[in-house]
Amino acid sequence: LTCLGGFASPGPVPPSTALRELIEELVNITQNQKAPLCNGSMVWSINLTAGMYCAALESLINVSGCSAIEKTQRMLSGFCPHKVSAGQFSSLHVRDTKIEVAQFVKDLLLHLKKLFREGQFN
């Protein structure tokens, strides 16, 4: 988590705080989900490894008009050191599987929680 710009704060946000807020937001999305998230929009699945934050943003940024994930998109931009725009796939090494946004969020959440439990947030 090298770049933490993009968060509305007076100073730098400690990595653990920023990651916590991302997890909290993903938890809120999964717990408050009633209708299909983002109308069942499909996004590219990603490898949850190095460069995951940029890859996640590049995948989710192609979903438009979905207010439920706008905050997540903003938060992910704070973890990605380069500007990401729709249709950009420089971090998405493998583009062979599309999944629903709801499943994408769930997979990302599970992985981030595991990183945090292991103390790997720096």
Partner: antibody, heavy 123, light 111 residues
């Protein structure tokens, strides 16, 4: 109903290894976001977190005691075991096991506790 | 390590009166949405019991005379109308990072 029961020796000698077992019921350590921790309390003193283990076998230890502690689980037996090496009289305390009751699946707070077992370290 | 400091160390309150316990963390344990601060009650000879999690969320079955507040580094546990069964030692605990630490405890007695 959630229950946790600690078992182990009431008396250990200095330099010996303490092995404590937490046997629980009412929940499963194979369930996502579930975990079990150990906390101790010297007589008349405050609580000290020692270690905990998550359903997916992620283990965390108090850095001040990490070299002496090992935590493990046996999901099929509903048990969590803590070992503590090189016991010293200052380790005399009531040792509690407790279930982690997190909302988020990564932070450890403890919503159910065992009655505790008093361990005295003396020669 | 995050140091948790409770005040006062002991407190004597008349039955039916308000009891207030403070807990200060040596660094912030809050995000913009949640505070990773928990409160426990320990009666003599018993294990601790979780009262409040995430600073203000009352645990199921806990009487509503107990409440928690605060964010950042400063937190408060309030018993709005002290009952005889509330005599105990109360501990705060952060769940922000390893190692999870507890306050030294506040003993609440009847005046």
């Amino acid at each position: 109903e959630v229950q946790l029961v600690e078992s182990g020796p009431a008396l250990v000698k200095p330099t010996q290894t303490l092995t404590l077992t937490c046997t629980f019921s009412g929940f499963s350590l194979s369930t996502s976001d579930m975990g079990v921790g150990w906390i101790r309390q010297p007589p008349g003193k405050a609580l000290e977190w020692l270690a905990h283990i998550w359903w997916d076998d992620v283990k965390r230890y108090n850095p001040a005691l990490k070299s002496r502690l090992t935590i493990s689980k046996d999901t099929s037996k509903n048990q969590v075991v803590l070992t503590m090496t090189n016991m010293d009289p200052v380790d005399t305390a009531t040792y509690y096991c407790a279930r982690i009751g997190t909302n988020y699946g990564y932070d450890a707070l403890f919503d159910y506790w065992g009655q505790g077992t008093l361990v005295t370290v003396s020669s | 390590d995050i140091v948790m400091t409770q005040s006062p160390d002991s407190l004597a309150v008349s039955l039916g009166e308000r009891a207030t316990i403070n807990c200060r963390a040596s660094q912030s344990v809050s995000t913009s949405s949640y505070s990773y601060m928990n409160w426990y009650q320990q009666k003599p000879g018993q294990p601790p019991k979780l009262l409040i999690k995430y600073a203000s969320n009352l645990e199921s079955g806990v009487p509503d005379r107990f409440s928690g507040s605060g964010s950042g580094t400063d937190f408060t546990l309030t018993i709005s109308s002290l009952q005889a069964e509330d005599v105990a030692v109360y501990y705060c605990q952060h769940s922000w990072e390893i190692p999870y630490t507890f306050g030294q405890g506040t003993k609440v007695e009847i005046k």
